[in-house]
Amino acid sequence: LTCLGGFASPGPVPPSTALRELIEELVNITQNQKAPLCNGSMVWSINLTAGMYCAALESLINVSGCSAIEKTQRMLSGFCPHKVSAGQFSSLHVRDTKIEVAQFVKDLLLHLKKLFREGQFN
């Protein structure tokens, strides 16, 4: 994939360490949730397919002032090789569907656990 004179390439399938850490953080968020997560903020739903990490970051980055997900945002940036900023829109978003951050985190967690079980770390 050539992009603006640069060369983007997928890396080898990384060891499970990174994915496990991300799953642990999402578990931590769901378990420690008392009041509505991020005051019930809504985010775009995403297709949980290739490019999922970047799409998840693009969606969550639009939630500001929510310390509970700051670590998740930072962790997702370590999975996504692109520069992501608030207001960006990805084709991987389900444009007409917005869900609460809490539901977004649960959906993402379930999918990542499935990938982990199947040994698909990338």
């Epitope: 640069g6 990174a18 945002q73 996504c80 090789p81 900023s85």
Partner: antibody, heavy 120, light 112 residues
């Protein structure tokens, strides 16, 4: 505190390969990009590429596509750059630098650099 | 590739003076996400570069307020209001908006 510790200086023969390392400590390795930068003696800085340690995905400068391969070992929090088919043009100091999401991906911490000398 | 041109190449100053370094890009460096990833780094003799300014005008943690960055589009400036001895070295601008990311050629700040 955040530290990027790079491997020692290397003297290699033309045509050979070398693998330089950058060991990270003091932060969650998989949450920040690692950039690699080249500096030839008395010259400026050149960006080689960056790697997202969580996925192993890279963005590379096309100019270094056949020269440099970026990898990570998340279990040891170490990033690597593998330089192949070395020539005198590759004699330089190579820096690794952390790309921070918090500071809009700017390179907020740098390793001390590894000097590679290509000579027969 | 985006060419980053810095002027002057060398900047002799007296301690306490103001210094200004210009950086011009060969094309607009606004990223597709709307942000301008323009940074300034200082490399002191025999050391690794250090981050001073990110996203055009934001000072990195611990950077004295005598350093300020400004600009937009293709023209950017780093200003040092009162030069101190520890400020001497080579200053590089860097664009991280378009791959391959590129550095300016450097400006050497030295004592007059």
């Amino acid at each position: 505190q955040v530290q990027l510790q790079q491997s020692g200086d290397d003297l290699v023969k033309p045509g050979a390969s070398v693998k330089l390392s950058c060991k990270a400590s003091g932060y969650t390795f998989t949450s920040y990009w690692i950039n690699w930068i080249k500096q030839r003696p008395g010259q400026g800085l050149e960006w080689i590429g960056h790697i997202a340690p969580g996925s192993g995905e890279t963005y590379d400068n096309e100019m270094f596509k056949d020269k440099a391969k970026l990898t990570v070992d998340t279990s040891s929090s170490t990033a690597y750059i593998h330089l192949s088919s070395l020539s005198s043009e590759d004699s330089a100091v190579y820096f690794c630098a952390r790309g921070s999401f918090t500071f809009f991906y700017a390179m907020d911490y740098w390793g001390q650099g590894t000097s590679v000398t290509v000579s027969s | 590739d985006v060419l980053m041109t810095q002027t002057p190449l060398s900047l002799p100053v007296s301690l306490g003076d103001q210094a200004s370094i210009s950086c011009r890009s060969s094309q607009n460096i606004v990223h597709s996400n709307g942000k301008t990833y323009l940074e300034w780094y200082l490399q002191r003799p025999g050391q690794s570069p250090k981050l001073l300014i990110y996203k055009v005008s934001n000072r990195f943690s611990g950077v004295p307020d005598r350093f300020s960055g400004s600009g937009s589009g293709t023209d950017f400036t780093l200003k040092i209001s009162r030069v101190e001895a520890e400020d001497l070295g080579v200053y590089y601008c860097f664009q991280g908006s378009h791959v391959p990311y590129t550095f300016g050629g450097g400006t050497k700040l030295e004592i007059k």
